[in-house]
């Protein structure tokens, strides 16, 4: 699962993308708060 | 250069409303999390809510204190953030800060404003 | 809510020593826990996040450790502009927390 503030799927989807890889759609838990606070 | 710039503080009575502002520039604004947190006068620091992102719904959370009196929201295309504080109380005394959170996984980025002070007295 | 409590509330120490700052949480936080290094008149800076990872441009001097309840922010020789207060937060859990802060001073 992704924890992170701007979950690493979605911020890298365009660069993976780019560059032949595969992102798998996740999501940020609701109850889990960001790392970057 | 990044720079986070909060408005709208001033004296209010109690009961009365405020609407604080924070206009973001040198960065994604809309990748990133939001939060605003507080200091009161001479006291500790005061987490009071959070808006997500924009691919991340922009969810919000709120500290119980403020839940059912402020409102957090964002406008992307305006590179800014609010809040609405309503039924204000002394105790929401404080300088409020916005701070804007990025984590892509192998770092993060994490910017503070310089606060807008908030006064709530008869 | 997850409580976080810093101790000491004051630190007394001379430039050069080794300074370490301690942070409790009341429940389990994995390493959802960051530093912040705050100076009168100025809003805070983040300095080490995810427990034990500097931020951008931090010196080396300052480094965090811990998991799960208990945590330490240590400055291994003291610099002249490190004496501010220190507030650890945790993000594992709503509402986010603070500790109290424990105010850095010099002897």
């Known amino acids: 699962s992704c924890n992170t503030a701007t979950c690493v799927t979605h911020r890298l989807a365009g660069l993976l993308s780019r560059s032949g890889g595969v992102v798998k759609d996740n999501f940020v838990p609701t109850n889990v708060g960001s790392e970057a606070f | 250069e990044v720079q986070l710039v909060e408005s709208g503080g001033g004296l209010v009575q109690p009961g009365g409303s405020l609407r604080l502002s924070c206009a973001a520039s040198?960065?994604?604004?809309?990748?990133?999390?939001i939060s605003w947190v507080r200091q009161a006068p001479g006291k500790g620091l005061e987490w009071v809510a959070e808006?997500?992102?924009?691919?991340?719904?922009?969810?919000?959370h709120y500290a119980e204190a403020v839940k059912g009196r402020f409102t957090i929201s964002r406008d992307n295309a305006k590179n800014s953030l609010y809040l609405q504080m309503n039924s204000l109380r002394a105790e929401d005394t404080a300088v409020y800060y916005c701070?804007?959170?990025?984590?892509?996984?192998?770092?993060?980025?994490?910017?503070w404003g310089q606060g807008t002070l908030v006064t709530v007295s008869s | 809510e997850i409580v976080l409590t810093q101790s000491p509330a004051t630190l007394s120490l001379s430039p050069g020593e080794r300074a370490t700052l301690s942070c409790k949480a009341s429940?389990?936080?994995?390493?959802?826990v960051s530093w912040y290094q705050q100076k009168p008149g100025q809003a805070p800076r983040l300095l080490i996040y995810?427990?034990?990872n500097r931020y951008l441009g931090i010196p080396a001097r300052f480094s965090g450790s811990g998991s799960g309840t208990d945590f330490t922010l240590t400055i291994s020789s003291l610099e002249p502009e490190d004496f501010a207060v220190y507030y650890c937060?945790?993000?594992?859990?709503?509402?986010?927390?603070f500790g109290q802060g424990t105010k850095l001073e010099i002897k």
């Open positions: 701070l804007a959170y990025f984590d892509y996984g192998l770092a993060i980025q994490n910017y």
């Open positions: 040198g960065f994604t604004f809309s990748n990133y999390w």
């Open positions: 808006i997500r992102s924009e691919s991340d719904a922009s969810a919000t």
């Open positions: 429940k389990r936080v994995t390493t959802y």
């Open positions: 995810g427990a034990s």
């Open positions: 937060s945790q993000s594992y859990n709503y509402p986010y927390t």
